[in-house]
């Protein structure tokens, strides 16, 4: 799910290359993490579960061709995509009446691109057109970057993780002195 956010009109993701045909199971599981109907908890994990690999800011690789109009790169480029959670979940849903709100237990961090690299690619065009050279910006590394209450939805959307988006039926964090976090947190490395 996360990697699709990096697709734009100038690129096409080629699943048939076999390097990353579909979102990994970790991301599939993550989709359930923030659904209001699940109370913010993954449905099938027992309370004691500690899975180090599942909840971390990871650099996933996928391969894509670069396109520009009818022209396409001679070779696919390999890019990193930032995926996963930065540390244990830091939100606990609290029900008050019919509404739900969050209580934080720490700053909100997101796994986002850190450094980029430029790569020169040759684009082949149909109809005997001369090949074009083009520079593309690719993600080179990821980091756990802190979000503030001032980040708006459009900024969050760019991070490409469902967990970054506000959920229906939930109010923003209240001003709470105390902090509790998701009961089903899993161990993690940043």
């Amino acid at each position: 799910q996360g990697w699709q956010a990096f697709k734009n009109d100038a690129t096409e993701i080629i699943p048939e290359l076999g390097e990353y045909p579909e979102p990994p199971p970790e991301l599939e599981n993550n989709k359930t993490m923030n659904r209001a109907e699940n109370g913010g908890r993954p449905p099938h994990h027992p309370f004691e579960t500690k899975d180090v690999s599942e909840y971390s800011c990871r650099e996933l690789h996928f391969t894509r061709y670069v396109t520009d109009g009818p022209c396409r790169s001679a070779k696919p480029v390999t890019e990193l995509v930032c995926s996963g959670q930065c540390g244990p979940a830091r939100l606990l849903p609290n029900a008050i009446g019919r509404g739900k709100w969050w209580r934080p237990s720490g700053p909100d961090f997101r796994c986002i691109p850190d450094r980029y690299r430029a790569q020169r690619v040759q684009l082949l065009c149909p109809g005997g057109e001369a090949p074009r050279a083009r520079k593309v910006r690719l993600v080179a590394s990821c980091k756990c970057k802190r979000l503030t209450r001032f980040h708006n939805q459009s900024e969050l959307k760019d991070f490409g993780t469902e967990a970054a988006r506000p959920q229906k039926g939930r109010k923003p964090r209240p001003r709470a002195r105390s902090a509790k976090a998701n009961q089903a947190e899993l161990e993690n490395a940043y």
Partner: antibody, heavy 123, light 107 residues
Framework: EVQLQQSGPELMKPGASVKMSCKAS????????MHWVKQNQGKTLDWIGE????????GYNQKFKGKATLTVDKSSTTAYMELRSLTSEDSAVYYC????????????????WGAGTTVTVSS | DIQMTQTTSSLSASLGDRVSISCRAS??????LNWYQQKPDGTFKLLIF???RLLSGVPSRFSGSGSGTDYSLTIYNLEQEDFATYFC?????????FGGGTKLEIK
Amino acid sequence: EVQLQQSGPELMKPGASVKMSCKASGYTFTDYNMHWVKQNQGKTLDWIGEINPNSGGAGYNQKFKGKATLTVDKSSTTAYMELRSLTSEDSAVYYCARLGYDDIYDDWYFDVWGAGTTVTVSS
Amino acid sequence: DIQMTQTTSSLSASLGDRVSISCRASQDISNYLNWYQQKPDGTFKLLIFYTSRLLSGVPSRFSGSGSGTDYSLTIYNLEQEDFATYFCQQGDTLPYTFGGGTKLEIK
């Protein structure tokens, strides 16, 4: 008064494991994440990781992954850190620190610190 | 990881002086910068959070400023109890990282 009381000094052999404690008092233990920080002989500080006392969920600095394990005992309002496969590099003072929150500025900081546990690894 | 650099490892000053301690981050940390004081007995105390916000109970002679990658802690009218080691810490990117510390000594 909010306090974090840490266990006493430890003299350990290389290869051994040590488990130190951090007893919290004066506040609701499950309402604040507990963090651990290492201070080596050169006085530099390294953040080890955090644990949520409410759930037991922990997160670690990659540098300490496999070295440190954080746990809590809610009934005794105590946080623990175990260090394994000790080497001389692990000789340091280890601090537990509570992560506090300022709701006006939406900011977080280590507002209460323990006095530290000195670990010496020597053969 | 973000590197936090306190270029001055030790600083000598006299009672009543004004001193500034600098801290530089290897990248922009969006003002998520805290300052801590460590006394000779090893005890830590938070002084300033979010670059310039004084924690309740901390004397007003302590002041923080900065933005982007460059930050500083200024202590006005130095008192005996201020002679200690001061650390900066960034809270913008995980893992949290600290500066190497600046030891303030009496001249």
